[in-house]
């Protein structure tokens, strides 16, 4: 039996629509918006849950304009071309022909063009910095309970391998989680840097995407971690394009 | 299809040992973790210990010091080494395996399970 099995639904991504209709009555769940069959005992990637963000009624959804903080995610929510295994298509285009080539974790990585542009590859995005500023609290927690906490929370709530999360620095009120996985290093089933990073990103503010879990609880030591601001900074295993233009702007 | 088969269980005094086995068939990639869980009559199945494809291990703060988890993965077999055994031990163990490498306890990262073996701990 699986976790999903019990009453058909998808413990892990509550953007499904579940029916017992897989091999031999099991249930099986499918992404809104793309109707891709999911594996429920394991992250969703980025780009259906984006597809299925995208495919909500407008006024089932809440908060979809990115932070005003977002840096790197400007170009903040879009309808994404997925491949048959579920990642970021390397081109983007939207409805008006304007295309642009993405990393695996579906940021923009060169400037929009047309319909000619083309995007030999996907590019891998192999270290995540996640930037947090906690609220301000009686005194600094302690790096070391901080860093265990950070950590068992990838490894059990994202199912991220502990040696993908290479480091947890701490200057308050500034937290900065580093995440790395090369290429080399993913393997079938291991659950991808960049997808953990987003669930992490919607718990933090508040639409966690997990069915009938409570949401983030962060504590360190039994005191509470109330994240006001987040950042996230994709470093690509090749290095983006854009013209000077925009690196003047 | 994966197959998982407990073995091992039993009563035994606080303070004793046992030691399971769980027999893994059907799988064609040795990439998949695996774990112990219990549950415990009118309780929530929790997990107990966990073993990934590195043979990394994590544990039940409760159980740390007292139970082993090890795999032998020529023979597909995984084990629980239970010492000083407690009559709060007592409860039905699962084995359990996850596609891929990880190390959790949340039972919702594994998508196969056995049927469970009996232990009971008498005070």
């Known amino acids: 039996h699986t976790a999903a099995q019990d009453n058909c639904t998808c413990p892990t991504n509550k953007m499904t629509v579940c029916s017992p209709d897989g091999p031999g009555g099991r249930c099986q769940c499918r992404a809104l918006g793309s109707g891709m069959a999911v594996d429920c005992s394991t992250l969703t990637s980025k780009c259906l849950l984006l597809k299925a963000r995208m495919s909500a009624p407008k006024n089932a959804r809440t908060l979809v304009r990115p932070s005003e903080h977002a840096l790197v995610d400007n170009d903040g929510l879009y309808d994404p071309d997925c491949d048959p295994e579920g990642r970021f298509k390397a081109r983007q285009c939207n409805q008006t022909s304007v295309c642009w080539c993405v990393n695996s974790v579906g940021v923009r990585r060169t400037d929009k063009g047309d319909l000619s542009l083309r995007c030999d590859e996907l590019v891998r995005t192999h270290h995540i910095l996640i930037d947090l500023r906690h609220r301000p609290t009686a005194g600094a927690f302690n790096h070391s309970d901080l860093d265990a906490e950070l950590r068992r929370l990838f490894r059990e709530r994202y199912r991220l391998h502990p040696k993908f999360v290479a480091a947890v620095h701490y200057e308050q009120p500034t937290i900065q989680i580093e995440l790395r996985q090369n290429t080399s290093q993913k393997a079938a089933g291991d659950v991808d840097i960049g997808d953990a990073a987003y669930y992490f990103e919607r718990d933090i503010k508040g639409e966690s995407l997990f069915q009938g879990r409570g949401g983030l609880d962060l504590r360190v030591r039994g005191e509470p971690l109330q994240v006001e601001r987040t950042l996230i900074y994709y470093l690509d295993e090749i290095p983006p394009k854009f013209s000077m233009k925009r690196l003047t702007a | 299809q994966v197959q998982l088969q407990e073995s091992g269980g039993g009563s035994v005094q606080a303070g004793g040992s046992l030691r399971l086995s769980c027999v893994v068939s059907?799988?064609?990639?040795?990439?998949?973790?695996m774990a112990w869980f219990r549950q415990a009559p009118g309780k929530e199945r929790e997990g107990v210990a966990g073993?990934?494809?590195?043979?990394?291990?994590t544990y039940k703060p409760s159980v740390e010091g007292r139970f082993t988890i090890s795999r032998d993965s020529a023979k597909r077999t995984l084990y629980l080494q239970m010492n000083s055994l407690k009559p709060e031990d007592t409860a039905m163990y699962y084995c359990?395996?996850?596609?891929?490498?990880?190390?959790?306890?949340?039972?919702?990262?594994?998508?196969?399970w056995g049927q469970g073996t009996q232990v009971t701990v008498s005070s």
């Open positions: 073993i990934d494809t590195d043979v990394l291990t």
């Open positions: 059907g799988y064609t990639t040795t990439r998949y973790s």
């Open positions: 359990a395996t996850g596609t891929g490498n990880f190390l959790a306890l949340d039972p919702v990262w594994y998508n196969t």
